[in-house]
Interface confidence: low
């Protein structure tokens, strides 16, 4: 059977194009190594935003020029993507793999829809 | 059967190290964590740490670093727990404990508990 | 970390009767676990990941709820029942227990 994933329905990027929330799998948090990944859906396609992994010692490292940071807690990782435009705007799905030791476990969470509003352009001054 | 064997009752000094072991068996040792949990007479319970026994690293309850060092021997399928500058405040009962499995996790199994005394 | 509140403290439930143990998280947190520890003896499980009983556990036990608050109930008591009752959360570390509930039986 599939393992559980638990993220929230729906976030507001803030005005910079940053959006942040939590990803939980129910599982023990207890892994010695778990992978994390962003994927955004947009109609029938899938694409990977973002990935990272982490052990219960090392923190979750995200490539340096990542679009997504993120901390891990037990079961619990908070993530935040950056740079978001309005043509961001769409389903992130949160995919949480529990790679080693044996058994592997996979967990798909619903989605969280994420609404990127761009700012309107600042008037020129003189 | 999932079992964890404890080792016997401990008796120390105030300033002395104790090491509890917990034996396991009727499972493959380094598919799962071993969790200690303390609990000092009357009260609640409270999670030491964990470790990996494929891997051997350790999570910590920051209340116990430095108190407490896991540890595992594969070949024996024998998790260890060492208590270092032993004082009162640390007579308790000492569980080991072990996840239902890897899907749903809980503590399923313990161990049957070592009881740690420190008197001089 | 996650601090873990249990209500009541303890109760003194009849035979028969139903008895109900509230656990409250310092924060949200995924699944709750609950423990029973009869006196001498190790925790056994009793309800994981929330709502699910474990292996051998009558079905006099459930449990239920979300967030920060949750559950714990037994429709009708029976004297085998008497113990401490515990709630665990495995949300973030470290993991951390409530701080027990004793039901004794009137």
């Known amino acids: 059977k599939g393992m559980h994933a638990a993220q929230p329905a729906v976030v507001l990027a803030s005005s910079r194009g940053v959006a942040s929330f939590v990803c939980e799998y129910g599982s023990s948090g207890n892994a010695a190594e778990v992978r994390v990944t962003m994927l955004r859906q947009a109609g029938s396609q899938m694409t990977e935003v973002c990935a990272a992994t982490y052990t219960v010692e090392d923190e979750l490292a995200f490539l340096d020029d990542s679009t997504c940071t993120g901390t891990s807690s037990g079961n619990k990782v908070n993530l935040t993507i950056q740079g978001l435009r309005a043509m961001g705007t769409g389903l992130y799905i949160c995919k949480v793999e529990l790679m080693y030791p044996p058994p592997y476990y996979v967990g798909m969470g619903n989605g969280t829809q994420i609404y990127v509003i761009d700012p309107e352009p600042c008037p020129d001054s003189d | 059967e999932v079992q964890l064997v404890q080792s016997g009752a401990e008796v120390k000094k105030p300033g002395a190290s104790v090491k509890v072991s917990c034996k396991a068996s009727?499972?493959?040792?380094?598919?799962?964590?071993m969790d200690w949990v303390r609990q000092a007479h009357g009260a609640s319970l409270d999670w030491i740490g964990n470790?990996?026994?494929?891997?051997?690293?350790?999570s910590y309850n920051q209340k116990f670093k430095g108190k407490a060092t896991l540890t595992v021997d594969k070949s024996t399928s024998t998790a260890y727990m060492e208590l270092s500058s032993l004082r009162a405040g640390d007579i308790a009962v000492y569980y080991c404990?072990?996840?239902?499995?890897?899907?749903?996790?809980?503590?399923?199994?313990w161990g049957q508990g070592t009881l740690v005394t420190v008197s001089s | 970390q996650i601090v873990m509140t249990q209500t009541p403290l303890s109760l003194s439930v009849s035979p028969g009767e139903p008895a109900s143990i509230s656990c409250s998280a310092s924060?949200?947190?995924?699944?709750m676990h609950w423990f029973q520890q009869k006196p001498g003896q190790s925790p056994q499980s009793l309800i994981y990941?929330?709502?699910i009983l474990a292996s051998g556990v009558p079905d006099r036990f459930s449990g239920s709820g979300s967030g920060t608050d949750f559950t714990l109930k037994i429709s009708r008591v029976e004297a085998d029942d008497a113990g401490v009752y515990y709630c665990?959360?495995?949300?973030?570390?470290?993991?951390?227990f409530g701080t027990g509930t004793k039901l004794e039986l009137k």
């Open positions: 009727g499972y493959t040792f380094t598919d799962y964590n």
């Open positions: 990941s929330t709502s």
């Open positions: 924060s949200s947190v995924t699944y």
């Open positions: 665990q959360q495995r949300t973030s570390y470290p993991l951390t």
């Open positions: 404990t072990r996840d239902g499995n890897r899907y749903d996790a809980w503590f399923a199994y």
């Open positions: 470790i990996n026994p494929n891997s051997e690293s350790t």
